[in-house]
């Protein structure tokens, strides 16, 4: 906390400019008018104030706006944003995407800080949903942003926003998140033709049900093994050997290398060994010939 001392003669700041970097903290406190600072915030970022000096400037703004800064000030915070606490940010009402971009730019190249997370939360809640422009902006700065949201939060993403999602944005998503995103992607891309559709939907297939995988197997998509390994186990298990062969196309040979890993391992256990043998890959562990397979879940459903 800087002591309240009178401003030395001739040092009263008439504008926010480079000369202020030579002021000690107490001089900034005494000689810079908070209202002047607020109206000339756009200049602060271009002036190389030390972090200690920025603390003083923040203190002045806090005194001027105890209920939270107006957006006209927030948009020009620049490096001063790094001095804000999540508690400060919770007082803000940020509605402009330009303001959001300006503040994310300051934090660029760093991990998502609690301040940034709070800012994004305030912004998205204010908008009511994650629209395409917002999602575009957030994933540009933080590719993992989408996967940091809960399934409940993802449910507010409109299908139209899915067009902004890049494959790398989904790298860290878990199956629960993909379960929410997949139907939205399916809706978003429904008017595309077969091969184009598969290119777009591929990243979301970790949320696809069995019937959609069966449908894809009829379209010569040649799914790669990396995508296949991310499919839901419960969606893969009912697929026949013929369907998996059609789904993977030339990539079917990769099953051998993955036979000990899910979902391939569990799928093998559900197939007849003679069906697996037709692939000529030496996959072992299928149901021996002559055994009868009872689907108990089906039986329970009927009773």
């Amino acid at each position: 906390e800087v002591e309240k001392t009178a401003c030395p003669s001739g040092k009263k700041a008439r504008e926010i400019d480079e000369s202020l970097i030579f002021y000690k903290k107490w001089e900034l406190e005494a000689c810079v008018d908070a209202a002047l600072l607020a109206t000339q915030m756009d200049r602060v970022n271009a002036i190389p104030f030390t972090y200690e000096q920025l603390d003083v400037l923040k203190h002045k703004l806090d005194e001027l706006y105890p209920q939270g800064y107006p957006e006209s000030v927030i948009q020009h915070l620049g490096y001063l944003f790094l001095k804000m606490s999540p508690e400060d940010i919770r007082k803000w009402n940020v509605t402009s995407l330009e303001t959001l971009k300006a503040l994310l730019e300051v934090n660029k190249g760093h991990e998502m800080s609690p301040q940034v997370a709070t800012l994004i939360d305030r912004f998205v809640k204010g908008r009511g949903q994650l629209d395409k422009d917002t999602l575009d902006t957030l994933t540009a700065f933080y590719p993992g942003y989408l996967c940091s949201l809960s399934p409940e939060e993802l449910s507010s993403v409109p299908p139209s926003s899915i067009w902004a999602v890049r494959p790398q944005d989904l790298d860290t998503c878990d199956p629960r998140q993909l379960d929410v995103l997949y139907p939205k992607a399916r809706l978003a891309f429904q008017n595309m033709n077969g091969s184009e559709y598969f290119v777009k939907i591929q990243s979301f297939l970790g949320g696809a049900p069995t019937e959609d995988l069966k449908a894809l197997s009829q379209q010569n998509v040649s799914m790669d093994l990396a995508t296949f390994m991310k499919l839901r186990t419960d969606a893969v298990l009912p697929l026949t050997v013929a369907e998996v062969q059609k789904l993977l196309g030339p990539h079917v040979e990769g099953l051998k290398a993955e036979e000990r890993h899910r979902p391939v391992r569990d799928w093998i256990l559900r197939q007849r060994q003679d069906d697996l043998d037709t692939l000529g890959l030496g996959l072992q562990g299928g149901i021996p010939n002559g055994y009868l397979v009872l689907d108990l879940s089906m039986q329970e459903a009927l009773s």
Partner: nanobody, 115 residues
């Protein structure tokens, strides 16, 4: 890694002269605005002088006319020529890139002026 090494400090009598040097590595020196900061015992950090990449200079009121900042891009070094030294110039002097926004932090070089 950005490294700045200050040297040239010492103990002198009031009215004498000292020349501080700061040798930089790990960044493009020619493109950087540089500054000399100082911190006296029990006082707060103060910016003494700056030199921008285009060579323009600025000084704190307390040292104007006595201190001169300069740089040698070939040697990646910035200097602070201090004349007519006063006891109140006693401090640890540090050089920084202005973009770092760090101010008085790190080793620095101690200047002691006795009357």
């Amino acid at each position: 890694e950005v490294q700045l090494v200050e040297s040239g400090g010492g103990s002198v009598q009031a009215g004498e002269t000292l020349r501080l040097s700061c040798t930089a590595s790990g960044f493009t020196f020619d493109d950087s605005d540089m500054g000399w900061y100082r911190q006296a015992p029990g006082d707060e950090c103060e910016l003494v002088s700056t030199i921008s990449s285009d060579g323009s200079t600025n000084y704190a009121d307390s040292v104007k006319g006595r201190f001169t900042i300069s740089q040698d891009n070939a040697k990646n070094t910035v200097y602070l020529q201090m004349t007519s030294l006063k006891p109140e110039d006693t401090a640890i002097y540090s050089c920084r890139t202005m973009a770092s926004r760090i101010g008085c932090w790190g080793q620095g070089t101690l200047v002691t002026v006795y009357s």
